[in-house]
């Protein structure tokens, strides 16, 4: 799969492949994988992809199920790239405070916060 | 500050304190702090709080600016707790696939994705 495929298209295709291969993926009834308790998904990317790795190692490969795992590894690559962009640019305090304000504002409005 | 204050109220108060103390915080004109290039904030919590630590070490403490940094450390504690909850519960593959589908769905609709 060319990595040039837009990430948004990659995600859509992966969702479709996930539905297609669901029966095959759940074949192992004894397998247990960590599942986050909350819905702040971005905080859990590491655990999600560890789980995907576990699932891949337990799944019979071949056909489009391979494409599913290839897609998921490209999505991981994209997220790793985004994580790199968290700390690459050193800016003045003013810009950092604008970003911090945005971050707290997002926490305030969009995060799923349990008291 | 009691940690019993609801996190949502804590975030609101912190936003107000950030506005109040802006002038004091930007006093150091040579200080540079990593600022994420994108708006997928949850991916960058580690760098954001490292930046807050840098800022705190360079800011004259006293009065309500101390409360600002105390609040920020409580918010960090909350996020660290959320991160712990990413991997604590081991579930069957079906539950993991439901979560993975939700995660990709959120990526598809809510993440800030550049092609």
């Amino acid at each position: 799969i060319p990595t040039e495929i837009p990430t948004s298209a990659l995600v859509k295709e992966t969702l479709a492949l996930l539905s297609t291969h669901r029966t095959l993926l759940i074949a192992n009834e004894t397998l247990r994988i960590p599942v986050p308790v909350h819905k702040n998904h971005q905080l859990c990317t590491e655990e999600i992809f560890q789980g995907i790795g576990t699932l891949e190692s337990q799944t019979v490969q071949g056909g489009t199920v391979e494409r599913l795992f290839k897609n998921l590894s490209l999505i991981k690559k994209y997220i790793d790239g985004q994580k790199k962009k968290c700390g690459e640019e050193r800016r003045r305090v003013n810009a950092f405070l604008d970003y911090l304000q945005e971050f707290l504002g997002v926490m305030n409005t969009e995060w799923i916060i349990e008291s | 500050i009691p940690t019993e204050i609801p996190t949502s109220a804590l975030v609101k108060e912190t936003l107000a304190l950030l506005s109040t103390h802006r002038t004091l915080l930007i006093a150091n004109e040579t200080l540079r702090i990593p600022v994420p290039v994108h708006k997928n904030h949850q991916l960058c919590t580690e760098e954001i709080f490292q930046g807050i630590g840098t800022l705190e070490s360079q800011t004259v403490q006293g009065g309500t600016v101390e409360r600002l940094f105390k609040n920020l450390s409580l918010i960090k504690k909350y996020i660290d707790g959320q991160k712990k909850k990413c991997g604590e519960e081991r579930r069957r593959v079906n539950a993991f696939l439901d979560y993975l589908q939700e995660f990709l769905g959120v990526m598809n609709t809510e993440w800030i994705i550049e092609s």
Epitope: R92, D98, E102, V106 | K39
Partner: antibody, heavy 119, light 107 residues
């Protein structure tokens, strides 16, 4: 493709206000800051300020603070720059420009809007 | 505010010439500088960001260098479409500030 399309030319009297619009298309509006820059006839470029459509936060060049107001309408993916108490020296072409990333370079510019202030 | 001093303010050159424009910041701006091209009656267009990174689609004859306070834009072999005014912009600190511009004219 990514585009910023600005409103048409305006002629205003001194003391009046003007509101210039900048309609974004081809990308998710809330992902990028919108900057405003002006250029007086035969002169250089001058930064007015930026607005973050993600949270409506705006920051101004001190020179324009109190006279310029930056706003957005997320439902139409449009940014606005209003300048009040106009004087003849405000005659200029006003540009909107998109930040590539947070506090980053301007990767897309609007075509510009000429504002003429004359009695 | 950070002052950006650009030189020369204008220059005459021929097609094929190598052209260099410099920009000096009044304080350290790291590498947060972009170079912008503007043709008469047209909107500006960013060519280079972060001092030396060429934007996609911009010809490779354009290059940038420098960090801290001193920056340079070079056009290795001037083409007819390159006759324009060039501005540097610092986006390191608020307010963002531009150089006064360098007009590149045909000799």
């Amino acid at each position: 493709q990514v585009q910023l399309v600005q409103s048409g030319a305006e002629v205003k009297k001194p003391g009046a206000s003007v509101k210039v619009s900048c309609k974004a298309s081809g990308y998710t509006f809330t992902n990028h800051h919108i900057n405003w820059v002006r250029q007086a006839p035969g002169q250089g470029l001058e930064w007015i300020g930026y607005i973050n459509p993600y949270n409506d936060y705006s920051r101004y060049n001190q020179k324009f603070k109190g006279r310029a107001t930056l706003t957005v309408d997320k439902s139409t993916s449009t940014a606005y720059m209003e300048l009040s108490s106009l004087r003849s020296e405000d005659t200029a072409v006003y540009y909107c420009a998109r930040d590539y990333g947070n506090f980053w370079y301007f990767d897309v510019w609007g075509q510009g809007t000429l504002v003429t202030v004359s009695s | 505010d950070i002052q950006m001093t650009q030189s020369p303010s204008s220059l005459s050159a021929s097609v094929g010439d190598r052209v260099t424009i410099t920009c000096k910041a009044s304080q350290d701006i790291n590498s947060y500088l972009s170079w912008i091209q503007q043709k008469p009656g047209k909107a500006p267009k960013t060519l280079i960001h972060r001092a030396d990174r060429l934007i996609d689609g911009v010809p490779s004859r354009f290059s940038g260098s420098g960090s801290g306070q001193d920056f340079t834009l070079t056009i290795s072999s001037l083409q007819p479409e390159d006759f324009a005014t060039y501005y540097c912009l610092q986006y390191d600190d608020f307010p963002y500030t531009f150089g006064q511009g360098t007009k590149v004219e045909i000799k």
